[in-house]
């Protein structure tokens, strides 16, 4: 009589997560009598996956009815495969005994699980930065297998090249994670910009997953300030305007100072948005010229997004105002439209207009 052989015809089987895996095994002889067991791995730490003789294996079904007469097909089907099921499975024949004795093993079938990557999550910097600064965005995706994966970055549809990507772990694993960090240089026009992290994997059938982040969460566009005086009104009041333009985000507090004393404080809210996503705001201050003997120094003080205040001063020349309606106004603008912001890298940027 021929010696029993245990045949596992496939060296490897690849299955998508959530599907069933069929692991084939046949014996070449009915002799000796004894059950088949399936193990994952070898040696003392091997894991029992299915035993024909005893045990409860809710996810495992024999392909062929074990009670079928003269059965020599010991293939099994494992349902609802997850990445944790990856490994090499061995079909092992036992000889009937007390206890049954291991007789012969098949060569093993390596089960690899194709698992989709999770939706990429893109996170931006913890603090906002201004134009010309470089900020980092991180993209993470987890739980995929096999390890091969492609990640690309885009800004407004244009592919980025300044990024670094790692896939972990480096060695064999049931599933893998990817983490990529891209460096993006901000411009004043980036309020409406978007960065996209695109992940391509064999499980996605050519339809990559995308994660996005809005640069609006990462950027701060400081305001321009301009203070101007309108015509003298009939009631000896001068209308002084502070125009705050091209700023983002909207969080802004404006304070009027008359000769260094706080006159009024306002908070920006519900402003219309410019095409580029920035905001403009205009504040007026009425100065009663007849109430002043000397020139009035008006200061428009703007605190934007928690940054140090920016001042723009303007002197109203009281002596230049005749006390009748409709006369020309004379004013001297002594302010310097200066914004002084301290950024993460401790550089100072001065803008003069």
């Amino acid at each position: 009589e021929e010696e029993l052989q245990v045949i596992q015809p496939e060296k490897s089987v690849s299955v998508a997560a959530g599907e069933s895996a069929t692991l084939n095994c046949t014996a070449t002889s009915l002799i000796p009598v004894g059950p088949i067991q399936w193990f994952r791995g070898v040696g003392p730490g091997r894991e029992l996956i299915y035993s024909q003789k005893e045990g409860h294996f809710p996810r495992v079904t024999p392909v062929s009815d074990p009670t079928k007469r003269n059965n020599m097909d010991f293939s099994i089907r494992i349902s609802n495969i997850t990445p944790a099921d990856a490994g090499t499975y061995y079909c092992v024949k036992f000889r009937k005994g007390s206890p049954d004795v291991e007789l012969k093993s098949g060569a093993g079938t390596e089960l690899s699980v194709r698992a989709k990557p999770s939706a990429p999550v893109v996170s931006g910097p913890a603090v906002r930065a201004t134009a010309e600064h470089t900020v980092s965005f991180t993209c993470e995706s987890h739980g995929f297998s096999p390890r091969d994966i492609t990640l690309k970055w885009f800004k407004n549809g244009n592919e980025l090249s300044d990024f670094q990507t790692n896939v972990d772990p480096a060695g064999k694993s049931v599933s893998y994670s990817i983490r990529s960090t891209a460096r993006v240089v901000l411009t004043r026009r980036d309020v409406h910009s978007q960065v996209i992290c695109e992940v391509a994997h064999v499980t996605l059938q050519g339809d990559p997953l995308r994660g996005t982040a809005n640069l609006s969460e990462a950027i701060r566009v400081p305001p321009f300030l301009e203070v101007t005086q309108q015509s003298m009104r009939a009631d000896n009041q001068v209308n002084v305007t502070c125009q705050v333009t091209k700023f983002y985000p909207q969080r802004l507090q404006l304070t009027w100072l008359e000769n260094g004393n706080v006159s009024r404080t306002e908070m920006a809210s519900a402003l219309p948005e410019n095409k580029d996503g920035t905001y403009n705001w205009t504040s007026w201050l009425l100065v009663n010229v007849s109430a002043h003997r000397d020139d009035v120094k008006l200061t428009c003080q703007v605190e934007h997004d928690g940054q140090p205040a920016v001042n723009k001063s303007f002197s109203v020349k009281v002596s230049a105002h005749p006390k009748e309606q409709g006369s020309n106004t004379a004013a001297e603008n002594t302010g310097t439209n200066e914004r002084d912001y301290k950024d993460d890298d401790d550089k100072h940027h001065h803008h003069h207009h």
Partner: antibody, heavy 119, light 110 residues
Framework: QVQLVQSGAEVKKPGASVKVSCKAS????????INWVRQAPGQGLEWIAM????????HYNQIFKDRATLTTDTSTSTAYMELRSLRSDDTAVYYC????????????WGRGTLVTVSS | DIVLTQSPDSLAVSLGERATINCRAS??????????IFWYQQKPGQPPKLLIY???NLDSGVPDRFSGSGSGTDFTLTISSLQAEDVAVYYC????????FGQGTKLEIK
């Protein structure tokens, strides 16, 4: 370790029925056939029938087809053999036996249940 | 049905001697290269015990003084050197179709 534990001895009147049980342990009950065999006093072995507990497929010896019924309760891993219309020549030891190799053989046996049919 | 006929009905053999029991089937019990004959030993007051399966394969724990041979319709159980504990009734059984047993052979010590 495979064990088949049978119910105790029974004394029955002619025309009555008897139901013998066989509780299995030490293996997956639904993966192996259970055979029933009887042996009259001083006589040889006589195969009655067999059942597949996984789907209750049965095969009967023609001699017993009309009088014997095999059933199983998979929740308790117990096989049953009911014999109806008992006659005095049904007096015998009734064995259950498990087929470990799906060869229609009898690898492991219960200790037997003596059924005595007497008026 | 396949009928199995054992011979002899009884047999007395001296300790240490060879004992041979025959089993003849009314038609072939061979299929796909296997001979579907099984041998059992039954001692008084005990259930039968499987000795040989598929004509020539020793079951687990059975001493190797027992052996089985034959094919087709004629089969033999041999005990090469009889021991006192071998006194029993021996049955052949086939499973080529639904099972049947031979009538049994009683083995005693001479």
């Amino acid at each position: 370790q495979v064990q088949l534990v049978q119910s105790g001895a029974e004394v029955k009147k002619p025309g009555a029925s008897v139901k013998v049980s066989c509780k299995a342990s030490g293996y997956t009950f639904t993966n192996y056939w259970i055979n029933w065999v009887r042996q009259a006093p001083g006589q040889g072995l006589e195969w009655i029938a067999m059942i597949d507990p996984s789907d209750s497929e049965t095969h009967y010896n023609q001699i017993f087809k009309d009088r014997a019924t095999l059933t199983t309760d998979t929740s308790t891993s117990t096989a049953y053999m009911e014999l109806r219309s008992l006659r005095s020549d049904d007096t015998a030891v009734y064995y259950c036996a498990m087929d470990y190799g799906s060869l229609y053989a009898m690898d492991y046996w219960g200790r037997g249940t003596l059924v005595t049919v007497s008026s | 049905d396949i009928v199995l006929t054992q011979s002899p009905d009884s047999l007395a053999v001296s300790l240490g001697e060879r004992a041979t029991i025959n089993c003849r089937a009314s038609k072939s019990v061979s299929s796909s290269g296997y001979n579907y004959i099984f041998w059992y030993q039954q001692k008084p007051g005990q259930p039968p015990k499987l000795l040989i399966y598929l004509a020539s394969n020793l079951d687990s724990g059975v001493p190797d003084r027992f052996s089985g041979s034959g094919s087709g319709t004629d089969f033999t159980l041999t005990i090469s050197s009889l021991q006192a504990e071998d006194v029993a009734v021996y049955y052949c059984q086939h499973s080529r179709e639904l099972p049947t047993f031979g009538q049994g052979t009683k083995l005693e010590i001479k």
